[in-house]
């Protein structure tokens, strides 16, 4: 049999080998496709199937506009002028080239030593699904699950049957100061079909700098609480990946598991004191927040006590 590839929506003509070019002809076309359950023999006189597959006067079969449901096998059996039976067998596959792939939500820059989402490559309207590949400086990127991570998603349109592919690339650059170029390509995996490429994106890789600031938020504001109340201390750090956070009270580390939140339920006078948090980042030394004072008072004094944070309830390291 012969393998035929046809573009969706385009006409396709299959010739019936051995068939006389003009009537009288002895021939039979049959098909087994997504429109049939078994073999369907086409009537030479034509009929309702003509919109899908029609026998032409020369014995060839015309598919006026191939669709996904027309994939399958087409066979012709003809008797030539010498009375010999000749068979033709075609395996028809259809394809649709999608629009040019695009990198959506691209990163503006990358940070060395930490995971960075480069962007999401999107291809819409392909058949069959095809594949998306990422390239770094023109070379194919092979995801290793560690430094190079690719998250893929394939969706099929319920009516058209065409595919949308999404591929999200995350990388951990090893060093700063470089300017890698990323691109993405779509391939249908068909012979003689060149991949479709996105416009490349060039990104700067910077060294991971120290966290821009470390803030200690206290609830209730002012750090003044009645006995039996609850105090929540939150260490807010703008660093990626999030560092480990330890807590200090009156200059001594608290024996607690690392956490960016310290909860003091049912406080008593023993909980009074000066609290701060220490953030430890893998590529930097520890950073300590400005301290806050916690006071337990029956009267609910107005205004913050001396040494406590101001009205905003947060201290900021300049």
């Amino acid at each position: 049999g012969q393998n035929i590839t046809a573009r969706i929506g385009e006409p396709l003509v299959l010739s019936c080998k051995g068939a006389p070019k003009k009537p009288p002809q002895q021939l039979e076309w049959k098909l087994n496709t997504g429109r049939t359950e078994a073999w369907k023999v086409l009537s030479p006189q034509g009929g309702p199937w003509d919109s899908v597959a029609r026998i032409l006067p020369n014995g060839s079969l015309l598919l006026p506009a191939t669709g996904i449901v027309d994939e399958g096998t087409f066979r012709c059996r003809a008797t030539n002028r010498r009375g010999k039976e000749v068979k033709s067998n075609y395996r028809v596959r259809v394809y649709q080239i999608p629009g040019k792939p695009e990198i959506v939500d691209p990163a503006s820059e990358l940070t060395a030593s930490v995971p960075n989402k480069v962007g999401t490559c999107v291809s819409e309207g392909s058949y069959p699904a095809g594949t998306l590949s990422w390239h770094l400086d023109g070379k194919l990127l092979i995801p290793d699950g560690k430094e190079t991570l690719v998250k893929e998603e394939t969706r099929r349109h319920p009516e058209t049957g065409l595919f949308t592919l999404r591929s999200e690339l995350t990388v951990i650059p090893t060093q700063g100061g470089t300017h890698p170029t990323f691109s993405c390509s779509f391939s249908l995996g068909l012979p003689r079909r060149r991949p479709l490429n996105t416009a490349p994106i060039q990104l700067r890789v910077r060294e991971p700098g120290p966290p821009e600031g470390i803030q200690l938020l206290v609830e209730p504001e002012g750090g003044i609480v009645a006995p039996g109340g609850t105090v929540t201390l939150t260490c807010a750090i703008s660093a990626q990946p999030p560092p480990q956070v330890h807590w200090i009270k009156d200059g001594a580390p608290l024996p607690l598991a690392p956490s960016p939140v310290l909860l003091l339920p049912e406080v008593g006078h023993e909980d009074e004191g000066t609290y701060s948090c220490v953030a430890t980042h893998p590529s930097h030394g520890p950073q300590e927040s400005p301290p806050v004072s916690i006071r337990v008072t029956e009267t609910g004094d107005e205004g913050p006590a001396e040494g406590s944070v101001g009205e905003s309830g947060l201290g900021t390291l300049a």
Epitope: R35, G46, P48, W49, D50, V52
Partner: antibody, heavy 119, light 107 residues
């Protein structure tokens, strides 16, 4: 909204001719095959003719072949049925319907037009 | 030519009844059968297409099924507006052939 409106029916003598029209709106006319179906008084439905979307290919049952001609004007979104050599048994309500191939088969119908063949 | 033998030709039923109408094709027509409803003085309305698919705007009490060359239209719970004549149609081959019709009347 898809609409099919037939016209041209009436009383005609045996052996006479009549031309029915069907005005289509609300859809892309040249994307669809079109079909005429008739119904004699108190009887069932009978297929009369079909035409492909381009108008190049037409189809008829033996009962009307060589007497009836289906045609279309895609520029005018119109379907026609030219009926010649009319017989008493052609008396029926004639409906125009969208489709007639295996992709779309008679999914929308007009209200019908009555053709009476009588002397 | 393909024959579509529809049965019964008429039936009497009450509101709420389950009603079944059958068409048998004289040869294989695949899935290419439609069901239509027609009320007096009105054009037919397609209910089911390609044997089992419910047409747009048709209540879900209507359903179609197929077993080989036997096609069935079922109304799960007959409503007052369902009293009408029902036709099957084969559109796999020319001539397109309708069944003889089934008139559903009030008992």
């Amino acid at each position: 909204e898809v609409q099919l409106v037939e016209s041209g029916g009436g009383l005609v003598q045996p052996g006479g001719s009549l031309r029915l029209s069907c005005a289509a709106s609300g859809f892309t006319f040249n994307n669809y095959w079109m079909t005429w179906v008739r119904q004699a008084p108190g009887k069932g439905l009978e297929w009369v003719a079909s035409i492909d979307n381009s108008g190049d290919n037409t189809y008829y049952p033996d009962s009307v072949k060589d007497r009836f001609t289906i045609s279309r004007d895609n520029a005018k979104n119109s379907l026609y049925l030219q009926m010649n050599s009319l017989r008493a048994e052609d008396t029926a309500v004639y409906y125009c319907a969208r489709g007639g191939d295996i992709k779309v088969s008679l999914d929308r119908w007009g209200q019908g037009t009555l053709v009476t063949v009588s002397s | 030519d393909i024959q579509m033998t529809q049965s019964p030709s008429s039936l009497s039923a009450s509101v709420g009844d389950r009603v079944t109408i059958t068409c048998r094709a004289s040869q294989d027509v695949g899935i290419y059968v439609n069901w239509f409803q027609q009320k007096p003085g009105k054009a037919p309305r397609r209910l089911i297409y390609r044997a089992t698919n419910l047409a747009d705007g048709v209540p879900s009490r209507f359903s179609g099924s197929r077993s080989g060359t036997d096609f069935t239209l079922t109304i799960s719970s007959l409503q007052p507006e369902d009293f009408a004549t029902y036709y099957c149609l084969e559109f796999d081959e020319h001539p397109l052939t309708f069944g003889g019709g089934t008139k559903v009347e009030i008992k």
